[in-house]
Amino acid sequence: MMTGTIETTGNISAKKGGSVILQCHLSSTMAQVTQVNWEQHDHSLLAIRNAELGWHIYPAFKDRVAPGPGLGLTLQSLTMNDTGEYFCTYHTYPDGTYRGRIFLEVLESSVAEHSARFQIPIEGRDYKDDDDKHHHHHH
């Protein structure tokens, strides 16, 4: 029985040329996370975080995507084409697969300065990862 839930950063906005952190967190389950896949709106994979082997950044994004913090992903040098949906897929044992959605809107710099951000940081739980210990999670 799948009891877990995925919490994500939800709808977020960021400036063109800037960077943004995509973050998902699996809670309410004791299932073991074996792998997290990060996908873009067109279903192309950005990155894999395998629990045993670590990170793999797909070649098309190697210059613009940085692993972490935690199981999240940092997308850099944003372009207008980066606007759209992003998905985190958690492969777990024994539960199976959980999927979370984030919508990123990339704004022209001038617009971004006068626009209210979608994301409202709220104090969240700390969680542990093999690579990065105790990263604050915003949801």
Epitope: N37, I48, N50, L53, G54, P59
Partner: antibody, heavy 121, light 106 residues
């Protein structure tokens, strides 16, 4: 220690079939993307195809010369990779290697010794 | 279909720097890998993901990849480095090898 051992090669007539196996050990096989690469006598390396891990869909990709004739599969419970070769041609004669795709820093293991497939009448 | 072009042969004196190039359309958007193969032996991965060295590969081997060209550089080349070298373009949908370069240490 990461180890890959290919087997199943041999002499087969044009139009025939053969199934190659690759026994993997020393790593968690189910995590790996695996490829088959071949090398004709005195020639260079040629990628045959690959199979992704189940957590990446377990999908397969093939090089144009073998598409529709060769099928790659895996049995994670047996730590074994397979290459089913049908409608073999003389130009398929080569040493066949199974390899680990270099996705991860800690899993870039050595190649096996390969297995020779000879297609001749 | 995607193609990679390597020079058939490169010569270098011991102790000097050898550079082997590999060219392909927008190769910089893919990962470049390099394999070393000595006569009668299986290939050995010497560079992966453009510039990373697997454990056990000497520091004199380095790689770069941008634009349409990937380069394998061997600094302080030794006689034992004489071999065939193959570049490989790797992405999530396909893999392609170059034709190979025979490195001769004079």
């Amino acid at each position: 220690e990461v180890q890959l051992v290919e087997s199943g090669g041999g002499l087969v007539k044009p139009g025939g079939s053969l199934r190659l196996s690759c026994a993997a050990s020393g790593f968690t096989f189910s995590n790996a993307w695996m490829s088959w690469v071949r090398q004709a006598p005195g020639k260079g390396l040629e990628w045959v195809g690959r199979i992704k891990s189940k957590t990446n869909g377990g999908t397969t990709d093939y090089a144009a010369p073998v598409k529709g004739r060769f099928t790659i599969s895996r049995d994670d419970s047996k730590n074994t990779l397979y290459l089913q070769m049908n409608s073999l041609k003389t130009e398929d004669t080569a040493v066949y290697y199974c390899t680990i795709d270099p996705l991860y820093d800690i899993l870039t293991g050595p190649w096996g010794q390969g297995t020779l497939v000879t297609v001749s009448s | 279909s995607y193609e990679l072009t390597q020079p058939p042969s490169v010569s270098v004196s011991p102790g000097q720097t050898a550079s082997i190039t590999c060219s392909g359309d927008k190769l910089g958007d893919k990962y470049a890998c390099w394999y070393q193969q000595k006569p009668g032996q299986s290939p050995v991965l010497v560079i992966y993901q453009d510039s990373k060295r697997p454990s056990g590969i000497p520091e004199r081997f380095s790689g770069s990849n941008s634009g349409n060209t990937a380069t394998l550089t061997i600094s302080g080349t030794q006689a034992m480095d004489e071999a065939d070298y193959y570049c490989q373009a790797w992405d999530s949908s396909t893999v392609v090898f170059g034709g190979g370069t025979k490195l001769t240490v004079l």
